[in-house]
């Protein structure tokens, strides 16, 4: 057992048919000695009496919040939740497994640029009783300094029958250099309630893996004298590091149709334009992606080729 | 020294051309090692992030460009003294900071070549002989070191008497070969740099 | 199985004409992009000029520029080229070839042999 | 226009053994450079897009590297079947080019 914030608190059970189960000791919080009773959740049976209670964690039914009282007034309440292990590996039960970019993947993560500021999802078909906390950090032995915000429903979709909830949340390296070489990775650790059930879930990574640069911007069209080529010209992305000639970015520009299965011109560039061919129905696309750390690709930006 | 004869532009910054060749390198050959050493912890994940040249060369910081100087987290500086010419500086109003960074970077090329040197004689004797360095890697090192023409002394090439524990040297290579791309992704982002200024 | 059958070899004197035809099979003709390119005996290889035979779409080598043309016949699959004011450097093993990627070919039809002779 | 330029022309080659043949263009060209396979009497076969990507049914011994100007095709291992010429394309710009071509001969 272990406290997972004030007067909360997580029992680790080896979850088979039969287990013994964890035995729990609880201390009212209280400098009284004697007529002190306890209760779970809202029963009003009485559990047993004195300043301690013994319990056998097994299921849970033996979980929840626990209360001590004296004389009909509350002294202290202890929240036990359940972390269950099975076949020696912790539960996962709350969040969704998104397989990218591998299996057991529960959270992930992307950075604009190398500002040291990056974000995190994850998702759940679970809507109610639930809720996360975060905490990051550079390195775990010797940890330094990721701020995290809360974490907030940032989408809902329709899957089949089910509903899909996504969360994220916004982290920022207390001190971070754009153009450091990182050596440690960065540490994220999300602690997930849901009802009774606690289950944490890690993911570590460098930043320089995790870029995504945001599309490139204001993209321009100017067509070429008697000819079907086109020049197309764009900015780099507002969010993306500064000075570009540094953090330098190259593209692909693409002109395809509607279906991903018509023909298409494509041609990468270091440059911000280039020339193409424009078909009727088509439109052109450019995408951006470090030039010199082969990260993600941003997402397209696009404009009409009439 | 000459420009190789496909240099795009005769004016170009003379060492961007092999810096650009040395990140190609340098990926090829961590790809081929990834590849070649499956069974061997090799990816980024696996492997601990080791900078040989850390308290040797301050590169990142000497090669800073000046809209982040201002950045606090970015001047975590450390004295040291380098030398102070090189033909990348060629025709070029070049500050102190610009030296010290191109000969930072040379320290590093320096250090870095004479590990792999070492390394290479050691996979050589490899019974399985089942990766070596790329001789092009080696080159393309030599040639960007050319390219900065610094004058320094000759670091010498470590020999070992004791018989080499090859599981050992394969993944010290797998961590000498992830840190060096992170360097060589600095150096060409140094080196775009310097031929955009 | 995609494929590009040419027409028969070719025996030209110089200054005339010469026109290739080129037949699709297998795919929608006009989701691809064609392509000419022809090979001097014992030489390279040297790109001509594509068209797209949804709209009829052209695009030549300027060293070709004006003596090249290339058609498309949709009801046909069939794609052709004529080549004008022969000479005998234009001996060549001409090549139909198409590809969803406008800038490089994945599909190549077997060769047609021009002869240029006087 | 770009011009491309192979070397070398020529490279005799032991089975088994690698080859690597290079590409240069006239220019920066970023990725847009393709690789083709011609055997004697037969239409050219595409080998690699974009530099390094490889195409469905071609055997993993053919790679690509390269950025720029500088280019690479890599045959890990020849097999007698990948005795030919091989040729590099530029698809930076129009015209389209094509390098004069490597042939691969038995040593």
């Known amino acids: 057992i272990w406290e997972l914030k004030k007067d909360v608190y997580v029992v680790e059970l080896d979850w088979y048919p039969d287990a013994p189960g964890e035995m729990v000791v609880l201390t009212c919080d209280t400098p009284e000695e004697d007529g002190i009773t306890w209760t779970l959740d809202q029963s009003s049976e009485v559990l047993g009496s004195g300043k301690t209670l013994t319990i056998q964690v097994k299921e849970f039914g033996d979980a929840g919040q626990y209360t001590c009282h004296k004389g009909g007034e509350v002294l202290s309440h202890s929240l036990l939740l359940l972390h269950k292990k099975e076949d020696g590996i912790w539960s996962t039960d709350i969040l969704k497994d998104q397989k990218e970019p591998k299996n057991k993947t529960f959270l992930r993560c992307e950075a604009k640029n190398y500002s040291g500021r990056f974000t995190c999802w994850w998702l759940t078909t679970i809507s109610t009783d639930l809720t996360f906390s975060v905490k990051s950090s550079r390195g775990s032995s010797d940890p330094q300094g990721v701020t995290c915000g809360a974490a907030t429903l940032s989408a809902e979709r329709v899957r089949g029958d089910n509903k899909e909830y996504e969360y994220s949340v916004e982290c920022q390296e207390d001190s971070a250099c754009p153009a450091a070489e990182e050596s440690l990775p960065i540490e994220v650790m999300v602690d997930a309630v849901h009802k009774l059930k606690y289950e944490n879930y890690t993911s570590s990574f460098f930043i320089r893996d995790i870029i995504k640069p945001d599309p490139p911007k204001n993209l321009q069209l100017k067509p070429l004298k008697n000819s079907r080529q086109v020049e197309v010209s764009w900015e780099y992305p507002d969010t993306w590091s500064t000075p570009h000639s540094y953090f330098s970015l190259t593209f692909c520009v693409q002109v395809q149709g509607k279906s991903k299965r018509e023909k298409k011109d494509r041609v990468f560039t270091d440059k911000t334009s280039a020339t193409v061919i424009c078909r009727k129905n088509a439109s052109i696309s450019v995408r951006a992606q470090d030039r010199y750390y082969s990260s993600s690709w941003s997402e397209w930006a696009s404009v009409p080729c009439s | 020294r000459n420009l190789p004869v496909a240099t795009p532009d005769p004016g170009m910054f003379p060492c961007l051309h092999h810096s650009q060749n040395l990140l190609r390198a340098v990926s090829n050959m961590l790809q081929k090692a990834r590849q070649t050493l499956e069974f061997y912890p090799c990816t980024s994940e696996e492997i601990d992030h080791e900078d040989i040249t850390k308290d040797k060369t301050s590169t990142v910081e000497a090669c800073l460009p000046l809209e982040l100087t201002k950045n606090e987290s970015c001047l975590n500086s450390r004295e040291t003294s380098f030398i102070t010419n090189g033909s990348c500086l060629a025709s070029r109003k070049t500050s102190f900071m610009m030296a010290l960074c191109l000969s930072s970077i040379y320290e590093d090329l320096k250090m870095y070549q004479v590990e792999f040197k070492t390394m290479n004689a050691k996979l050589l004797m490899d019974p399985k002989r089942q990766i070596f360095l790329d001789q092009n890697m080696l080159a393309v090192i030599d040639e960007l070191m050319q390219a900065l023409n610094f004058n320094s002394e000759t670091v010498p090439q470590k020999s070992s008497l004791e018989e080499p524990d090859f599981y050992k040297t394969k993944i010290k290579l797998c961590i000498l070969l992830h840190a060096f791309r992170i360097r060589a992704v600095t150096i060409d982002r140094v080196m775009s740099y310097l031929n955009a200024s | 199985q995609v494929q590009l059958v040419q027409s028969g070899a070719e025996v030209k004197k110089p200054g005339s004409s010469v026109k290739v035809s080129c037949k699709a099979s297998g795919g929608t003709f006009s989701d691809y992009y064609l392509h000419w390119v022809r090979q001097a005996p014992g030489q390279g290889l040297e790109w001509m000029g594509w068209i797209d035979p949804e709209n009829g779409d052209t695009e030549y080598a300027p060293k070709f520029q004006g003596r090249v043309t290339i058609t498309a016949d949709e009801s046909t699959s069939t794609a052709y080229m004529e080549l004008s004011s022969l000479r005998s450097e234009d001996t060549a093993v001409y090549y139909c070839?198409?590809?969803?990627?406008?800038?490089?070919?994945?599909?190549w039809g077997q060769g047609t042999l021009v002869t240029v002779s006087s | 226009d770009i011009v491309m330029t192979q070397s070398p022309l020529s490279l005799p080659v032991t089975p088994g053994e690698p080859a690597s043949i290079s590409c240069r263009a006239s220019?920066?060209?970023?990725?847009?450079l393709h690789w083709y396979q011609q055997k004697p009497g037969q239409q050219p076969r595409l080998l690699i897009a974009f530099a390094s990507q490889s195409i469905s049914g071609v055997p993993s011994r053919f790679s690509g590297s390269g950025s720029g100007t500088d280019f690479t095709l890599t045959i890990s291992s020849l097999q007698p079947e990948d005795f030919a010429t091989y040729y590099c394309?530029?698809?930076?710009?129009?015209?389209?080019?094509f390098g004069q071509g490597t042939k691969v001969e038995i040593k």
């Open positions: 394309q530029q698809s930076n710009s129009f015209p389209l080019t």
């Open positions: 070839a198409r590809n969803k990627e406008l800038r490089y070919i994945d599909v």
């Open positions: 220019q920066s060209i970023s990725i847009n």
